[in-house]
Interface confidence: medium
């Protein structure tokens, strides 16, 4: 079986005068592509990997949405030769609804990784954007994380950073084929420089309170302190299943519909870091 | 039908400037990576730069790196080509071609542009 | 000096079969880049004849077939007709040069 190979990590890496032909080992029955899509409010980028692939032919689309960080991934095997072609994986440019004015600052700002490398990535180094509020939900978090895509014995991973919807959740994560979007959230502008090793304590959790020796003469207090070490809860689950997109659109009720690659011949590698907001 | 059309080219000095326009039509142009490519009177083709479907990702041939500039208007359909510091030997027919399946599967009909002193 | 290595020229009698070569090296062919052949009919824009090593545009008659073998391709042309004298050229993309490259071309003669 021959099959096409590329590797994209927001870059041109797929793009139509970059494609390889590879030929599979022995036992190898099938081609893979697959694309992972992440969608911040302040721009989109996109993996992929196509090659070699292993199990059986089929589909499998998911979207994904993680405190307000949506994913989109595509996976694709199919056993004919060099037919892991299909897939479109281009990040398009996300439409504002209107200008800069329709989304008005909320005061909060964080480091904004969009498929910008590890190296590019690091610390205070990034861009900042200032949060706004869309769709009826608040921006008022910032996150750090990693988006990993494996297929085809490949496996690429970049940083994410942005604005999301959750100020206090820790080392969080979706799943999709072949897909992770993990990393935690923080509370106060510029917060996400570093959240590797962020704990699950955070200030929604009553502060122990060190109560003073009691006095030999007095009966002791019978006030009670709660304390907790769990995390702040949260809905039981943070995956809400979405078939993919064709665009991204900002989120104003926008229903998400079923992919269809309106020209499948066009297959052009990954945008960059497309901003939200003219 | 597809179709692209280049415009722009004519006669210059050497070291002036040209900004070469390309209009496409029959497909949907925001989807497809666009590239310049030129060839000189009686020689072979030669990629001059390309442009990814956004216009985020670019990438220029060495001969032509810090002179040219490619750029594109989505809403327009259309490709331009900026050049300037031009010299005798960019002296070629500038066609404008779309990438397909990995390769230019539409070409324009070229504008001729002559550096000359 | 092109990237891509063509004979300068070919030719053949109508009805026969001519193949052009294309060299390549590590950095295009050899690293698994699909190669492309372009038909230039004098004085015209290039078409594309062959994409991704083998395969044809609709409209591109069956008498055109590529082949890619380790760092070199070939296009050959049954069936010889006079339409068919053009300039050919191959073309790959470049890890090294990090875009497209072609071939010099091959002027191709029908005779008779």
């Known amino acids: 079986l021959e099959c096409y190979s590329c590797v994209q990590k927001a870059d041109d890496g797929c793009s139509p005068n970059k494609m390889k032909t590879v030929k599979c080992a022995p036992g190898v029955d099938v081609c893979t592509e697959a694309v992972g899509a992440v969608e911040t409010i302040h721009g989109q980028f996109s993996l992929a990997v196509r090659g070699c692939g292993s199990g059986l032919p089929g589909k499998n689309d998911r979207g994904l949405d993680l405190h307000g960080l949506l994913a989109f991934i595509q996976l694709q095997q199919c056993a004919q030769d060099r037919c892991n072609a299909k897939l479109n994986l281009t990040s398009r440019a996300l439409d504002p609804a209107g200008n800069e004015s329709a989304y008005p600052p909320n005061g909060v700002e964080c480091y904004s990784c969009v498929g910008l490398s590890r190296e590019a990535c690091q610390g205070t180094s990034p861009p900042v954007v200032s949060c706004y509020n869309a769709s009826d939900h608040v921006y008022k978090g910032c996150f750090d994380g990693n988006v990993t895509l494996t297929a085809a014995n490949v496996t690429v991973s970049l940083p994410v950073r942005g604005c999301v919807q959750d100020e206090f959740c820790t080392r969080d994560g979706v799943t999709g084929p072949g897909f992770t979007l993990s990393g935690s959230c923080c509370q106060g502008s510029r917060c996400n420089s570093d959240l590797r090793n962020k704990t699950y304590f955070s200030p929604r959790i009553p502060p122990l309170v060190r109560l003073p020796p009691p006095e030999p003469t007095t009966v002791a207090s019978t006030t009670s302190v709660t304390t907790s070490t769990s995390a702040p809860v949260r809905p039981t689950s943070t995956t809400k299943p979405m078939p993919a997109p064709t665009s991204q659109t900002p989120r104003q009720g926008v229903e998400h519909e079923a992919s269809r690659d309106e020209e499948p011949r066009l297959t052009g590698g990954a945008a960059g870091h497309q901003d939200r907001s003219n | 039908e597809v179709q692209l059309l280049e415009s722009g080219g004519g006669l210059v000095q050497p070291g002036g400037s040209l900004r070469l326009s390309c209009a496409a039509s029959?497909?949907?142009?925001?989807?497809?990576?666009m590239s310049w490519v030129r060839q000189a009177p009686g020689k072979g083709l030669e990629w001059v730069s390309y442009i990814s479907s956004s216009g985020s990702t670019i990438y220029y041939a060495d001969s032509v790196k810090g002179r040219f500039t490619i750029s594109r208007d989505n809403s327009k359909n259309t490709l331009y080509l900026q050049m300037n510091s031009l010299r005798a030997e960019d002296t070629a027919v500038y066609y404008c071609?779309?990438?397909?399946?990995?390769?230019?599967?539409?070409w324009g009909q070229g504008t001729l542009v002559t550096v000359t002193s | 000096q092109s990237v891509l290595t063509q004979p300068p020229s070919a030719s053949g009698t109508p009805g026969q079969r001519v193949t052009i070569s294309c060299t390549g090296s590590?950095?295009?062919?050899?690293?698994?880049?699909?190669v492309h052949w372009y038909q230039q009919l004098p004085g015209t824009a290039p078409k594309l004849l062959i994409y991704d090593n083998n395969k044809r545009p609709s409209g591109v008659p069956d008498r055109f077939s590529g082949s890619k073998s380790g760092t070199s391709a070939s296009l050959a042309i049954s069936g010889l007709r006079s339409e068919d004298e053009a300039d050919y050229y191959c073309a790959a993309f470049d890890d090294r040069l990090n875009g497209p490259v072609f071939g010099g071309g091959t002027k191709l003669t029908v005779l008779g």
């Open positions: 071609a779309r990438e397909g399946l990995w390769a230019f599967d539409y």
């Open positions: 029959g497909f949907t142009f925001s989807n497809a990576w």
């Open positions: 590590s950095s295009n062919i050899g690293a698994g880049y699909v």
